[in-house]
Interface confidence: medium
């Protein structure tokens, strides 16, 4: 006779799956906070910084009541993909001033990539509809000056921090509804 059948496949506990995603998101939130503080120390921000290519904010107090897991994960993944692209761009085109943020910026990129893979895995484990492949995004124009790169870094890290902050709260809330 052939080899004995393997143990029955246990379907993953969605709350535990979500828990580990929350932990990763919290960890990335802390990393982003530290890097944003480092950037502020080295290059103090004068006022607010915006970048039109960044995703618009997806969550707020009012949106929490209507949150649904598929929508949150899909939107979060799309937004984080955009931030990953912006971090990559920052490392490549941000100028010599931003080299002082290495290796932390590289670590942030790697952890962001890891969270994205974790979200993808969570969506497949929970049998959520997979989003269509992302259309190729138009290339980001290089900053017009060294100061432009620094302003962009403030906008990217600030936006990522805010997105992750809301993501933690939203994921914690969704966990209670599973």
């Amino acid at each position: 006779p052939g080899p004995p059948p393997g143990p029955p496949r246990v379907s993953p506990d969605p709350r535990a799956e979500l828990d580990s995603t929350v932990l990763l998101t919290r960890s990335l939130l802390a990393d982003t906070r530290q890097l944003a503080a480092q950037l502020r120390d080295k290059f103090p921000a004068d006022g607010d910084h915006n970048l039109d290519s960044l995703p618009t904010l997806a969550m707020s107090a009012g949106a929490l009541g209507a949150l649904q897991l598929p929508g949150v994960l899909t939107r979060l993944r799309a937004d984080l993909l955009s931030y990953l692209r912006h971090v990559q761009w920052l490392r490549r085109a941000g100028g010599s001033s931003l080299k002082t943020l290495e290796p932390e910026l590289g670590t942030l990129q790697a952890r962001l990539d890891r969270l994205l893979r974790r979200l993808q895995l969570l969506m497949s484990r929970l049998a959520l509809p997979q989003p269509p492949p992302d259309p190729p995004a138009p290339p980001l124009a290089p900053p017009s000056s060294a100061w432009g790169g620094i302003r962009a870094a403030h906008a990217i890290l600030g936006g990522l921090h805010l997105t992750l902050d809301w993501a933690v709260r939203g994921l914690l809330l969704l966990k209670t509804r599973l």
């Epitope: 919290r26 939130l29 921000a45 006022g47 607010d48 910084h49 915006n50 904010l57 707020s60 107090a61 009012g62 949106a63 600030g158 936006g159 921090h161 805010l162 902050d165 809301w166 933690v168 709260r169 914690l172 809330l173 209670t176």
Partner: antibody, heavy 117, light 110 residues
Framework: EVQLLESGGGLVQPGGSLRLSCAAS????????MNWLRQAPGKGLEWVGV????????FYADFVKGRFTISRDNSKNTLYLQMNSLRAEDTAVYYC??????????WGQGTLVTVSS | QSVLTQPPSASGTPGQRVTISCSGS????????VNWYQQLPGTAPKLLIY???LLPSGVPDRFSGSKSGTSASLAISGLRSEDEADYYC???????????FGGGTKLTVL
């Protein structure tokens, strides 16, 4: 540097009205939900309410529902608290605070509202 | 009467470790993030701990937070005289659809 500066506090009679303002600077105001909180003299902190970043949603504590209204003008980077039908127990220092998620990461210095005849 | 329960006072000597507790229910601490605020005499509150145990920029790592079930705690190690302040725990409450606070704990450094 993030700054929140409240104004508009003062002495008002019971049943009267007052409008508080909170001028924000140093961050993209239109990206953040904003809150009002208060602290009666010698007492603890009390949350009054929150308005979403785009003003589409508002939540209030039960004790102010129907009497207080939170609004914002993103073009002026300003948050408001309209207080009507004021009572003696509304006497407190009122703070505005920014919310990036579940917490208040920056607070103003506060403005004192005294309700007394 | 506050929704979250904290001891009204706590004390310690310089260098000591002190812990402040905060208890709630499943609708607040059990299901939501706990945040801690420090209020020095005569000043506005300041965020000390968020999402149960994360430290904002500029807060020394002598401060730490933890949560288990429907209770949370704030620990301060290597106590200093400048830590003398009121400390408040806070969380969103699902049933009230709002933010709730503990009554505050007055910390005295002896």
């Amino acid at each position: 540097e993030v700054q929140l500066l409240e104004s508009g506090g003062g002495l008002v009679q019971p049943g009267g009205s007052l409008r508080l303002s909170c001028a924000a600077s140093g961050f993209t105001f239109s990206h953040y939900d904003m809150n009002w909180l208060r602290q009666a003299p010698g007492k603890g902190l009390e949350w009054v309410g929150v308005i979403s970043y785009d003003a589409s949603n508002k939540f209030y504590a039960d004790f102010v529902k129907g009497r207080f209204t939170i609004s914002r003008d993103n073009s002026k980077n300003t948050l408001y608290l309209q207080m009507n039908s004021l009572r003696a127990e509304d006497t407190a220092v009122y703070y505005c605070a920014r919310t990036p998620g579940s917490h208040f990461d920056y607070w103003g210095q506060g403005t004192l509202v005294t309700v007394s005849s | 009467q506050s929704v979250l329960t904290q001891p009204p006072s706590a004390s310690g000597t310089p260098g000591q470790r002190v812990t402040i507790s905060c208890s709630g229910s499943s609708s607040n601490i059990g299901n939501n993030a706990v945040n801690w605020y420090q209020q020095l005499p005569g000043t506005a509150p300041k965020l000390l701990i968020y999402y149960d145990d994360l430290l904002p920029s500029g807060v020394p790592d002598r401060f730490s937070g933890s949560k288990s079930g429907t209770s949370a705690s704030l620990a301060i190690s290597g106590l200093r005289s400048e830590d003398e302040a009121d400390y408040y725990c806070s969380a969103w409450d699902d049933s009230l659809s709002g933010v709730v606070f503990g009554g505050g704990t007055k910390l005295t450094v002896l």
